[in-house]
């Protein structure tokens, strides 16, 4: 799997999970989240060469198509596969509220 | 939706469905499929600017992050959303066999 265990250990130009820390105030302009101040969001990036972690029949077909037609622009792309939620604390006035924001953290990637 | 109804009617540089006909023999080197000779596979391509059809909380966050940090390389990517199967006819010796290949046709796209 193109997850932290694999991608953070290896120098990988191909599609892989990349570390990305997002500071809510500085990077998003969000002042409304009290805790955490930021989080490891991560992101997916890198080339999708022939059959590198292709996730669907179509992406495998496209990968093969590109190998035979190298001038083609129709290539798979490196995107998130598994995502996890992030629990945040914010205030509604003086009242603290805990909320789980879905699909905030990328755990693994794929070529799609 | 970034589907044929929208994308094939509009000239769109941003993430959209693109037409792609794949000839099994010529483009994939597959001689084993008897019918059809090829099919409209389509593919997804184009830029994913600020919140263009972002499909998850993470891709929206990443989009906002990129707006505030334009030097960042962590941008969403244009990939397939809805896929459909393709029914094919091939032969096992002299015996015709009909098979449905899943996820072969891209029907719509998203920024992920």
């Amino acid at each position: 799997a193109l997850d932290a265990a694999y991608c953070f250990r290896n120098v990988q130009d191909n599609c892989c999970l990349r570390p990305l820390y997002i500071d809510f105030k500085r990077d998003l302009g969000w002042k409304w989240i009290h805790e955490p101040k930021g989080y490891n969001a991560n992101f997916c990036a890198g080339a999708c060469p022939y059959l590198w972690s292709s996730d669907t029949q179509h992406s495998r077909v496209l990968s093969l198509y590109n190998t035979i037609n190298p001038e083609a622009s129709a290539s798979p792309c490196c995107v998130s596969q598994d995502l996890e939620p992030l629990t945040i604390l914010y205030y509604i006035g003086k009242t603290p509220k805990i909320e789980q924001l879905s699909n905030m953290i990328v755990k693994s990637c794929k070529c799609s | 939706a970034l589907d044929a109804a929208y994308c094939f009617r509009n000239v769109q540089d941003n993430c959209c469905l693109r037409p792609l006909y794949i000839d099994f023999k010529r483009d994939l080197g597959w001689k084993w499929i008897h019918e059809p000779k090829g099919y409209n596979a389509n593919f997804c391509a184009g830029a994913c600017p600020y919140l263009w059809s972002s499909d998850t909380q993470h891709s929206r966050v990443l989009s906002l992050y990129n707006t505030i940090n334009p030097e960042a390389s962590a941008s969403p990517c244009c990939v397939s959303q809805d896929l459909e199967p393709l029914t094919i006819l091939y032969y096992i010796g002299k015996t015709p066999k009909i098979e449905q290949l899943s996820n072969m046709i891209v029907k719509s796209c998203k920024c992920s």
């Epitope: 998003l28 205030y91 | 909380q57 906002l64």
Partner: antibody, heavy 120, light 108 residues
Framework: DVQLVESGGDLVKPGGSLRLTCVAS????????MHWVRQAPGKGLQWVAY????????YYADSVKGRFTISIDNSKNTLYLQMNSLKTEDTATYYC?????????????WGQGTLVTVSS | ETVLTQSPGTLSLSPGERATLSCRAS???????LAWYQQKPGQAPRLLIY???SRAPGVPARFSGSGSGTDFTLTISSLEPEDFAVYYC?????????FGQGTKLEIK
Amino acid sequence: DVQLVESGGDLVKPGGSLRLTCVASGYTFSSNVMHWVRQAPGKGLQWVAYVIPIVDIAYYADSVKGRFTISIDNSKNTLYLQMNSLKTEDTATYYCARTLGLVLDAMDYWGQGTLVTVSS
Amino acid sequence: ETVLTQSPGTLSLSPGERATLSCRASQSLGSSYLAWYQQKPGQAPRLLIYGASSRAPGVPARFSGSGSGTDFTLTISSLEPEDFAVYYCQQYADSPITFGQGTKLEIK
């Protein structure tokens, strides 16, 4: 320069529907919590609803809960208020406003307002 | 919900005079959950003070806010002709956000 421009106000019959629009410009729209506030003719200000961009957390005043829906199109820098089952007491000028940053906060920028009249 | 009561309902003063507007909350707001707005006929409200005492950008120094708990005050040290308007206080300590009924500041 930060600008908020509302539109969509109209004369509508009781029980009818209307969608108000607020287009923002001059700042990173998705960074600030957005509110709708209304003001009946000759009366004071009344808070209606808020939405947190990107994460789409929304909250409503009891008087409009179940009838009004606040939504946002982050990519178009646009805030909406879908108003259904309108009552005569919903007649007011509707303002969209941006908070300083917190969910409940002072509102530093306001639109010019759009008038909704509910009458038979 | 928190009820805000503004007094007086109408204040008649002359340019150059000092104006003191009061806002009382039905429950404690703490020290920093109150804002003041100015509204002129046909216009949207304009933020003057937030956090009970912080002036919004571009607001003249003659406007000042004070108070905590349940009692808050907006003071205009020396009235200018353009200051005659309706003033609202707003609390954001508790949901829902509520506004006072307004104080009309008119020329005497």
